[in-house]
């Protein structure tokens, strides 16, 4: 919707556009409007962009009005939330960005017979993007000045410069997504796909044999198992076998049988022969041992001369027995072959939490810092390590020590500075802690050890011209006598600042007032009223451009008034034989300087931009994807980082390309399995998945990789009549009309006679971007005044 809010109105004299008073009569004395004020309300008309605004024609984007919202002068800037001064124009089409706005202030007549009268009108052509921010505009010419603000906002769930991209956050079967600031779907954690309705399975889940309905899940197909569904289930009962496909039982080396449970290499698997016996496989699960000399038994486990091989370690002595041998161990060792070190730390003999380290036939205690000795039973002297930092002395205690701290220090080692700041500083002063002391840092205006004293700033008598000084905190105030002002009463009041005199009058300051010296045409206290010269002086035609009028403001007693036949854009030059020519202002040409020179002739807009002619200027409306005064800059479409999952973005014209990584696909690298989704091709294009890339088939009016660039075809041939400029707008167009023409295709001649430019019952004749007044008897001049 388009919103407009009236902010303020200044109609000092309560006048209408035609010079009359809103409330009727003028005061004969000061020529000010008397009786009641204007009953001011506003009308708004919003239409397609026009470089020269025409008042007539349809308000193709909408129109509206406010109720009466004030009198002659009012300010509504502070009245937030008051909808009386707001006009809302909803639109159901894509916002075209460029527009023309007509705002008119009207006086309500409050009766059905008398029509309402126009006070002032403003027009504005421009470009506005949807935003929550307001754009302030001012009307500063004519009888009344007013200020208003405008903005365009998209409806809920609509995004983009045209408010035509739809995205509504969703969390159900059809999608789990939020919408970013550009209206793109951003999947909730655990979901993927163009509609964010495909769960992202557990990382590593087999794409072939696993699937999921819930994010992070991995459900296996029949015959598959494991955390990632990548392991086949072997045949039930399979012992020493594996599978490549479900239900197989492929035997490991040296295993046989249907279930791979028969050991074909018993010797290798169990190594049953001891003492260097040689093993031979004799059949499934069968073997035979050949024993070396001196050993016997099925596994060569019986030693016939046991002590020969020195089986007792660590200097143990060996004794042969009927079962083999027996070892007698040396101190500190135990076990059948004396190879186990006896744990001398069991039980632990170390006192006061000491750690016991086992040695051969002995132990060692590692003591905590406060203890020493073989079993940590002796008190250590901690003062030897000089632990006290800011102390007078160190005393050794049992299992501890004591530091006698210097003043201002505390803590076990006297290393903590005592905080002496205990709220002594007054008047919000800050306290800085020192060693055994503090210092107060006073805020401006205070002094003393504790900032308890207010400094008297009046002590230096700063006030001038008899001003009275008032002492305040960190400042003083001067109370000035009449006629003086300023912070020190140093200024004589200047009633001419700001200047109250209007229409270029000189202001003179007096002791308690001011005086305006009015130029010849004006009168009144502030020189705000136009003199009625016709009451006093007759006029005389001098030449085809000038009339003379008696005046006491010039040395010759005559004042010359120029004709406005050349309109607002030229000056009249008198020629012989009652003829004249017009000297035109920059940017205008023609007999009456009524034609705006076409500044677009040199085609300054680049990259397919459309040039809109202005007055001695031009404006470029850029093709999609370009910006800058001449459409010279390619907009960086990568600025929003559209590529997901580590994809690299490359900027194109009104488009971008994502170079996807690690198997991700699609326009924004968001999909695992398809290059295409509903959002890949814009403006109704059809997407085709071509394996490593996608291709868009575009409908009429669109081209580019993703159907994102509008073809000029909607402007070919030019549908705009009478020299209008065609601006491509997707599959349609907008015409920017030349002066004097209006309507969607610039086919209607603007009514230059609106509103009534001819005074004193003169008849208006409308031309192409000009008008002529045919005056009633007794009146003359271009507007019969």
């Amino acid at each position: 919707q388009f919103e407009l809010e009236i902010l303020s109105m200044q109609n000092v004299n309560g006048e209408l556009q035609n010079g009359n008073c809103c409330g009727g009569a003028r005061n004969p004395g000061d020529r000010k409007c008397t009786r009641d004020e204007c009953d001011t309300y506003f009308k708004v008309c919003l239409k397609e962009y026009q470089s020269r605004v025409t008042a007539g024609g349809p308000c193709s984007f909408g129109s509206g009005s406010t109720p009466v919202i004030g009198g002659n002068t009012f300010n509504l800037k502070a009245s937030r939330g008051n909808d009386r001064n707001r006009i809302v124009l909803p639109f159901s089409f894509a916002w075209p960005r460029s527009y023309t706005l007509l705002v008119e202030a009207w006086d309500s007549s409050n009766d059905t017979v008398q029509p309402d009268s126009i006070i002032e009108k403003a027009s504005h052509s421009g470009m506005i993007n949807p935003s929550r921010q307001w754009q302030t505009l001012k009307q500063n010419t004519g009888v009344a000045h007013f200020e208003y603000q405008i903005r365009v906002t998209c409806d809920d769930y609509y995004y983009g410069f045209g408010c035509n991209k739809f995205c509504r956050p969703r969390d159900d079967f059809f999608g789990h997504y939020a919408c970013d600031q550009n209206g793109n779907k951003t999947c909730m954690e655990g979901w993927m796909g163009p509609e964010c309705n495909r769960a992202i399975c557990r990382q590593g889940c087999s794409p072939k044999h696993g699937s999921c309905k819930l994010p992070g899940d991995c459900r296996c197909q029949y015959g598959w198992q494991g955390l990632y569904c990548d392991k086949c289930i072997p045949h039930p009962g399979c012992v020493h076998g594996i599978c490549n496909e479900p239900w197989q039982c492929l035997c490991e080396t040296n295993w046989g049988g249907q279930l791979c449970d028969k050991d074909l290499n018993y010797c290798g698997t169990h190594q049953p022969c001891l003492n260097g016996g040689t093993c031979s496989n004799t059949g499934p699960d069968k073997y035979q041992c050949s024993c070396p000399e001196g050993y016997s038994g099925p596994n060569c486990e019986i030693a016939e001369h046991a002590c020969l091989s020195d089986p007792c370690h660590n200097r143990g002595s060996c004794k042969e027995t009927s079962l083999g041998f027996e070892c007698e161990c040396s101190p500190g060792w135990t076990g059948p072959t004396c190879s186990t070190n006896i744990d001398d730390c069991s039980p632990n003999n170390c006192s006061h939490g000491g750690t016991c380290q086992d040695l051969v036939n002995g132990f060692k205690c590692v003591c905590p810092p406060q203890w020493t000795g073989k079993t940590c039973q002796l008190d250590a002297n901690e003062c030897e390590a000089k632990p006290c930092v800011n102390a007078k002395s160190c005393k050794n205690l049992i299992a501890s020590y004591y530091c006698d701290c210097l003043p201002g220090w505390m803590g076990q080692n006297c290393d903590i500075n005592i905080n002496d700041c205990l709220g002594q500083c007054q008047n919000d002063a800050s306290c800085r802690d020192l060693v055994n002391g503090y210092r107060c840092i006073c805020p401006p205006g205070y002094a003393g050890d504790h900032c308890e004293r207010d400094i008297d700033e009046c002590a230096s008598n700063p006030c001038l011209n008899g001003g009275h000084c008032q002492n305040e905190i960190n400042r003083f105030q001067c109370l000035c006598p009449t006629g003086f002002s300023g912070n020190l009463c140093q200024l004589d009041i200047d009633y001419c600042e700001p200047n109250p005199c209007q229409n270029g009058a000189q202001c003179y300051n007096r002791a308690s007032d001011y005086f305006c010296k009015c130029p010849e045409d004006y009168e009144g206290k502030n020189c705000s009223h136009l003199k009625d010269h016709c009451r006093t002086t007759p006029c005389e035609v001098i030449d085809s451009c000038t009339v003379a009028m008696a005046s006491n403001d010039t040395p010759e007693g005559v004042r010359y008034i120029s004709s406005n036949v050349c309109g607002p854009h030229g000056k009249c030059k008198s020629q012989s034989g009652g003829k004249f020519t017009c000297d035109c202002n920059k940017g205008f040409t023609g007999t009456y300087c009524h034609e705006n020179i076409n500044d677009c002739e040199s085609n300054p807009c680049r990259n397919g931009g459309t040039c809109i002619d202005g007055v001695n200027s031009y404006k470029c409306i850029c093709s999609d994807g370009w910006e800058g005064a001449y459409c010279e800059t390619n907009i960086n479409d990568c600025s929003q980082n559209p590529c997901h999952n580590g994809g690299t973005c490359r900027d194109l014209v009104n488009d971008f390309y994502c170079d996807c990584k690690n198997g991700w696909k699609g326009k924004t690298c968001h999909s695992r399995d398809s290059q295409c989704d509903e959002a890949t091709c814009n403006n109704g294009g059809t997407c085709y998945d071509e394996g490593d890339a996608f291709k868009c088939m575009c409908p009429g009016g669109w081209e580019g990789t993703t159907c994102n660039i509008a073809r000029n075809s909607s402007c070919l041939p030019n549908p705009c009549h009478n020299g209008g400029t065609c601006v491509v707008n997707g599959e349609s167009f907008t015409c920017v009309c030349k002066e004097g023409w209006e309507g969607p295709i610039c086919a209607q001649n603007t009514n230059d006679c609106s509103p009534h430019p001819c005074y004193n019952s003169g008849t208006c004749v409308d031309g192409d971007n000009w008008y002529r007044c045919e005056c009633a008897p007794g009146f003359a001049g271009p507007d019969c005044r």
Partner: antibody, heavy 125, light 112 residues
Framework: QVQLVESGGGLVQPGGSLRLSCAAS????????MSWVRQAPGKGLEWVSA????????YYADSVKGRFTISRDNSKNTLYLQMNSLRAEDTAVYYC??????????????????WGQGTLVTVSS | QSVLTQPPSASGSPGQSLAISCTGT?????????VSWYQHHPGKAPKLIIY???KRPSGVPDRFSGSKSGNTASLTISGLQAEDEADYFC????????????FGTGTKVTVL
Amino acid sequence: QVQLVESGGGLVQPGGSLRLSCAASGFTFSSYAMSWVRQAPGKGLEWVSAISGSGGSTYYADSVKGRFTISRDNSKNTLYLQMNSLRAEDTAVYYCAKEDLAMRRGYSYGYPGYWGQGTLVTVSS
Amino acid sequence: QSVLTQPPSASGSPGQSLAISCTGTSSDVGGYNYVSWYQHHPGKAPKLIIYDVNKRPSGVPDRFSGSKSGNTASLTISGLQAEDEADYFCSSYAVNNNSPYFFGTGTKVTVL
């Protein structure tokens, strides 16, 4: 007011085909997702298929995937369900339903807001 | 096919209150507030009477109300009237289900 009227039901042999239609009125048809829901005799309701407002996205229950096709003609305000390879277990009253949206913690979700009166499909030899 | 459990029937005299339960799991009713209730007169179109657990569409009398506790949703009809005699079924969304919404077994309400 919203109105949904189903048609096209009837008796068909196993393996045969049938096309159901649902004529919609009283709302902007192209702005809403639509669904087909069925109820077999003596059983509960079962969702069958759904289609997005533009017709660009379609969804099917596992039991009908590959046999049924949902479509819509937004210019005619009509929803369709093409049913091929019909089985005895497809016998049911078929309802078309308009999806409405509710908001919960800033996210919308769908639920069947309006239903038609249903059309009976019987698959029998 | 239906996974939400409802009592097969319920009855009450005119003017009385009547409650129907709809029990699911933490994956559906318990985990989401996406519960709706429908009234179905035989041969007519089912009609939405409650959505979002406890919200009433315009035109539905305020004697119909909805609530939820844990994995069970409830529909209460206070001040039972003769025209309330119909089948009632609940519906919910389940995150791990294959369908956008699935339904209760249905309850036949009789006004004595």
